[in-house]
Amino acid sequence: KSPVFGPQEVSSVEGNSVSIKCYYPPTSVNRHTRKYWCRKGASGRCITLVSSEGYVSSNYAGRANLTNFPENGTFVVNIAQLSRDDSGHYKCGLGINSRGLSFDVSLEVSQGPELPNGTEVYTVDVGRTVTIKCPFKTENAPKTKALYKKIGQTSVLVIDSRNYVNPNYKDRIRLRIPGTGQLIFTVVIDRLRLSDHGLYLCQAGDGSNRDEKNADLQVLEPEPELVYEDLRGSVTFHCALGLEVANVAKFLCRVNSRETCDVVINTLGKRDSAFEGRILLNPQDKDGSFSVVITGLRKEDEGRYLCGAHSDGQLQEGWPIQAWQLFVNEESTIPRSPTVVKGVAGGSVAVLCPYNPKESQSLKYWCLWEGAQNGRCPLLVESQGLVQEQYEGRLSLLQEPGNGTFTVILNQLTTQDAGFYWCLTNGDTRWRTTVEIKIIEGEPNLKVPGNVTAVLGETLNIPCHFPCKFSSYEKYWCKWSNTGCQTLPSQDEGPSEAFVNCDENSRLVSLTLNPVTRADEGWYWCGVKQGHFYGETAAVYVAVEEKKVAGSRYVSPAKADAAPDEKVLDSGVREIENKAIQDPRLFAEEKVVADTGDQAGGSRASVDSSSSEEQGGSSK
């Protein structure tokens, strides 16, 4: 028996569409082999109508396609504008029509319900708006216009031009009679309900001269779009509900086991706490469409989601909705990375951010999630080097370790830095991830002077004390700029007085600038790393002043001043919203932090060669 499976019988009516889903074992060979949909002829041969290699027969041109979903082991054949000629026996299969793996499908297209001659068919989703057009002759122009609904053998008046409105349609129906010369009136029904489904009759005038027109209104429940996303990844629900509800509150909700719908987020400021830090509702376009992004997907996020519009910001019958069924794939391509990173006040964190390794050239970004209103995520740093000015000297995005991971380092931590941050790129949007930074009790492991004033033309030596637990790590000094942190030569100088309990294992690594130039002014970082994986960092600001006294200057922690006040500059905030979430280059304009001079500080940062310690553990 064939391992390919699908619906054995598909039945529909003329004018409709079908989506035939065929299942196959998702082996690597099957995933990549040709998929086809063919029709069995009298001779027994099966003539291809559409295939995964792009072939579409002339009979199917413009109305059919085949889409393969290799990750799920399925492919779907969509056929629109069905006619009774499409009834017949078909096969969906893999490989070659005559000897591949296949499954037999019978398609039956019937005429559909018998409708009176000249009936106009209106097919509309629940909650949307329909406009029924009713023509009439000149002699009936001054006469009463009406719309009836046929229920069995009777006709029930729905609305007429004498201001009658059936209570079932109250506040959602209107009859429009155009100006002179236009021989057509329209009936507009908003917020369609399933119960509105049925046959309607337009009437103008009365007696034997009256004009009549039949309308068949088909109100459809929105079929959920199947969405498959990876664990730890991101999903975007794009919601387009129509201009009619452009100014009405919007929401996304999740259907629960009681078949009600719990609000996940809405434009009235409500948000489910389970999505704290990992959801954004992006402001709507002029047409009323909006999108909701959820990152850090969990298995428990699976389910049926509905987006909709209603003044209460929650699901109500008869208002437009769109539906999705979200499946979260546990065999995720997105690597595990910590969802919570802890740091101490004054210390630092190094956050690993995954990205699609196939997109190594993509621009990388890091933003701070803000929960106010619908949520927003102003960009703090990007791989091109732009850094929000208030983060100058303490934030850097590094391309290392590469191959699907970049690193963001944030130091000089304060309690204000606690919160949720998003890693993203301008490439694959499904790879957005969320990390929470928590500030905990404790002392920074690396100790550096808080504020250093160097004298032009002289020698400056900056110490960085590190504890014994970092003895096997590589140490480095680098000069921070808004495009990164350029590593400088440094010196491992042996025992440090700063960690008395560590004895000989406590070390200090120092940076020497000789001679000091104007270009040396700026932020310097001392840090530890293992290979391409970064650990803690500490930052020190070096100010350069005119020469006053000759001689070298050595700064010890005892003499160090407090770190300078952070510069907070008024800048336009770049946010993930609207289309910008897809392409961060579309963000609002913003001032860029000026590059702080020659990154390497000339080549005067030197190693003290007289040291008895080997240089092996320090950055070169």
Epitope: F5, P7, Q8, E9, V10, S11, S12, V13, N16, S17, V18, S19, I20, K21, Y23, N72, G112, L194, Q218, L220, E221, E223, P224, L226, V255, S257, R258, E259, T260, R304, Q325, F327
Partner: nanobody, 126 residues
């Protein structure tokens, strides 16, 4: 909540026919597919047939073991699904369960279904 109630089970002779019904009640607005599974003593629950729908289009799926003998149908107005079983065999003896789903990735997989009935016994004697 969606409630499913099966009926129509019983004891029949091999070669006879039986018609099972499954009536759905409650908030059925999100239901997208209904089907039948069966479980014989000491065996795992196995897929029999499922019908899914979108508007006036129906898709019917059958297990190989029942193809050509069993037919699934539904009455939209009554929110009821029927299973017509012809040419019954002793191997068809089992408890038959009705199941409903909001969305089906694969209709053959029991875990894809959100709601289940209590089951109705079908016994086919030789």
């Amino acid at each position: 909540q969606v409630q499913l109630v099966e009926s129509g089970g019983g004891l029949v002779q091999a070669g006879d026919s039986l018609r099972l019904s499954c009536a759905a009640s409650g908030r059925t607005f999100t239901t997208y597919g209904m089907g039948w599974f069966r479980q014989a003593p000491g065996k795992e629950r196995e897929f029999v047939t499922t019908i899914t729908w979108s508007g006036s289009t129906n898709y019917k799926y059958y297990a190989d073991s029942v193809k050509g003998r069993f037919t699934i149908s539904r009455d939209n107005a009554k929110n009821t699904v029927y299973l017509q079983m012809n040419s019954l065999k002793p191997d068809d003896t089992a408890v038959y369960y009705c199941a409903a789903s909001t969305v089906l990735r694969d209709p053959r997989v029991p875990t894809e279904y959100d709601y289940w009935g209590q089951g109705t016994q079908v016994t086919v004697s030789s």
